[in-house]
């Protein structure tokens, strides 16, 4: 499970509030860090192990997911044809 946590706020400038947000994710046994719907998530460790990246549903709804050659990452293709590539180190 993941929740968005506001780490700090800049109250020195009253006209605008700057909030730094991060995800706090507590993964269950057998899960490790991943990406689901373009957000941090906990995913089945075997997905990471086997590099079946699209199984963790990393793309936004309506986008198509494809594995890169050698399973080095994935691409998310928007309906309009724009492609976003993510590589895993």
């Amino acid at each position: 499970t993941c929740e968005i946590v506001t780490l700090d706020r800049d109250s020195s400038q009253p006209r605008r509030t700057i909030a730094r947000q991060t995800a706090r994710c507590a993964c269950r046994k057998g899960q490790i860090a991943g990406t689901t719907r373009n957000k941090p998530s906990c995913v089945d460790a075997r997905i990471i192990k086997t590099k079946q990246w699209c199984d963790m549903l990393p793309c936004l709804e309506g986008e198509g997911c494809d594995l890169l050659i050698n399973r080095s990452g994935w691409t998310c293709t928007q309906p309009g044809g724009r492609i976003k590539t993510t590589t895993v180190s």
Epitope: R24, G30, P40
Partner: antibody
Framework: AVTLDESGGGLQTPGGALSLVCKAS????????MFWVRQTPGKGLEYVAE????????NYGSAVKGRATISRDNGQSTVRLQLNNLRAEDTGTYFC??????????????????????WGHGTEVIVSS | ALTQPSSVSANPGETVKITCSGG???YGWFQQKSPGSALVTVI????ERPSDIPSRFSGALSGSTNTLTITGVQADDEAVYFC???????????FGAGTTLTVL
């Protein structure tokens, strides 16, 4: 190189308590789940306890549940096992172990027994009167 | 509980296979030369091999059974090999009773 160094073993009295410490070095300690595993004369290897990379989660083997407390200090790169109400069956060699998965910042991750990639040399505990 | 054979034997140069079944998630294999002495991981996360472990050691997962293979066994490989994983419910770690490898 990854090193895990256990200390705190020795002769203990039944009904007493012990505190074992594992000092880690050579890796980003706060990113890894950690384990205590013991080897008792009649039982082979036995899962004792584990703790998540950030210390928020703990789990215990059935033989020590209710008597053991595992904790960690990520600033000092140490993991501690406290075991109370000692019994003769607690006699054995206690090993500290690391789970290989490096949990990224912002995540709390459990280790996995099948992902243990490094062990300490072990510290011997004898419970006897 | 995990199931692994209590003992196997082989001549130098032969291939040895040790199976372990009954767990969940991933499997590891841990070598111990004598009781109470240091444990050495030879395989972790099903098939990963630490950099200092010879390539003759390999692991493979099929269903819920993991097989440790030692190709071209050597006298120095004589030891007890424990498998480790999570119990079937995924609530705690569990180890096999150990397989004693004797090199004839």
């Amino acid at each position: 190189a990854v090193t895990l160094d256990e200390s705190g073993g020795g002769l203990q009295t039944p009904g007493g308590a012990l505190s074992l410490v594992c000092k880690a070095s050579g890796f980003t300690f706060s990113s890894h789940g950690m384990f205590w595993v013991r080897q008792t004369p009649g039982k082979g290897l036995e899962y004792v306890a584990e703790i998540t990379n950030d210390g928020s989660g703990t789990n215990y083997g059935s033989a020590v549940k209710g008597r053991a407390t595992i904790s960690r200090d990520n600033g000092q790169s140490t993991v501690r096992l406290q075991l109370n109400n000692l019994r003769a069956e607690d006699t054995g060699t206690y090993f500290c172990a690391r789970s290989t998965y490096e949990c990224p910042g912002g995540f709390s991750c459990w280790g996995d027994t099948g992902q243990i990639d490094a062990w300490g040399h072990g510290t011997e505990v004898i419970v006897s009167s | 509980a995990l199931t692994q054979p209590s003992s196997v034997s082989a001549n130098p140069g032969e291939t040895v296979k040790i199976t372990c079944s009954g767990g969940s998630y991933s499997y590891g294999w841990f070598q111990q030369k004598s009781p109470g002495s240091a444990l050495v991981t030879v395989i972790y996360w099903d098939d990963e091999r630490p950099s200092d472990i010879p390539s003759r050691f390999s692991g493979a997962l099929s269903g819920s059974t993991n097989t440790l293979t030692i190709t071209g066994v050597q006298a120095d490989d004589e030891a007890v090999y424990f498998c480790g994983t999570e119990d079937i419910s995924g609530t705690a770690g569990v180890f096999g009773a150990g397989t004693t490898l004797t090199v004839l």
